[in-house]
Interface confidence: low
């Protein structure tokens, strides 16, 4: 019997070989029941990919973003 469309997170897997220099822009998705989803638009091929939140430069980016938010 057909079921209603099931819940799926936007990121199927996370890519850990994404250079900061190849990122056009980032978006952080706050999707319920999902791990932190960070999506990058790449400069070289315009595709959107999910970035591993454990990447060093991502951690630095998030830290800066949070500091900015709390300073305001």
């Amino acid at each position: 019997k057909p079921v209603s469309l099931s819940y799926r997170c936007p990121c199927r897997f996370f890519e850990s070989h994404v250079a900061r220099a190849n990122v056009k822009h980032l978006k952080i998705l706050n999707t319920p029941n999902c791990a932190l989803q960070i999506v990058a638009r790449l400069k070289n091929n315009n595709r959107q990919v999910c970035i591993d939140p454990k990447l060093k430069w991502i951690q630095e980016y998030l830290e800066k973003a949070l500091n900015k938010r709390f300073k305001m």
Epitope: R8, C9, P32
Partner: antibody
Framework: QVQLVQSGAEVKKPGASVKVSCKVS????????MHWVRQAPGKGLEWMGG????????IYAQKFQGRVTMTEDTSTDTAYMELSSLGSEDTAVYYC????????????????WGQGTLVTVSS | DIQMTQSPSSLSASVGDRVTITCRAS??????VNWYQQKPGKAPNLLMF???TSQSGVPSRFTGSGSGTDFTLTISSLQPEDFATYFC?????????FGQGTKVEIK
């Protein structure tokens, strides 16, 4: 490779419902973001709805809200689109289409389409 | 809803001609525009996504450009197999609207 195979043509009376199926091969249905698009004879393409991973739910075009239901059977990797209260203006070819994805599911475009199912509404 | 206005609605051209199809969005949509080619009795076929990126296998004579509200699909040298209808589509936000189509016919 991914293939979407749709059910055959249907002829329906006004007021009836139609259920079109779309069988996925080459991938499992839960790995896809499936959408439905229709095209009236000689007209353009009209997006009806589909699964939006960012919201975690199926979203429908307002025009079809309350009249369309999109479901799936994960055991057979088949997606369904049911449209009720049919009128002559619903005569169209109905397509299922997969949204492009890599690591990120809703990656912009519809890259793979079913062959289309012609639904004719006539008394 | 975001409206996609495509022009021209039809055009006649000869093999070897340069053809340009334009699409205007009713609001700024960055580069979230895709282009499809459709032949009679067939499903649409993705040519271009993210405004300017070719889908794999698409001939290099097809190029896309634009950002914000104005987008262009160009066929640098029209080939016999290019006579078809072309649609733009926005994937910026649902509902994912299409342009009304441009039919490219043989002159």
């Amino acid at each position: 490779q991914v293939q979407l195979v749709q059910s055959g043509a249907e002829v329906k009376k006004p007021g009836a419902s139609v259920k079109v199926s779309c069988k996925v091969s080459g991938y499992t249905l839960t790995e896809l973001s499936m959408h439905w698009v229709r095209q009236a004879p000689g007209k353009g393409l009209e997006w009806m709805g589909g699964f939006d991973p960012e919201d975690g739910e199926t979203i429908y075009a307002q025009k079809f809200q309350g009249r369309v239901t999109m479901t799936e059977d994960t055991s057979t990797d088949t997606a369904y689109m049911e449209l009720s209260s049919l009128g002559s203006e619903d005569t169209a070819v109905y397509y299922c289409a997969r949204r492009v994805w890599g690591s990120y599911r809703p990656n912009d475009a519809f890259d793979i389409w079913g062959q289309g199912t012609l639904v004719t509404v006539s008394s | 809803d975001i409206q996609m206005t495509q022009s021209p609605s039809s055009l006649s051209a000869s093999v070897g001609d340069r053809v340009t199809i334009t699409c205007r969005a009713s609001q700024s949509i960055s580069d979230y525009v895709n282009w499809y080619q459709q032949k009679p009795g067939k499903a649409p076929n993705l040519l271009m996504f993210a405004a300017s990126t070719s889908q794999s296998g698409v001939p290099s004579r097809f190029t896309g450009s634009g950002s914000g509200t104005d987008f262009t699909l160009t066929i640098s040298s029209l080939q016999p197999e290019d006579f078809a209808t072309y649609f733009c589509q926005q994937s910026y936000s649902p509902p994912y609207t299409f342009g009304q189509g441009t039919k490219v016919e043989i002159k």
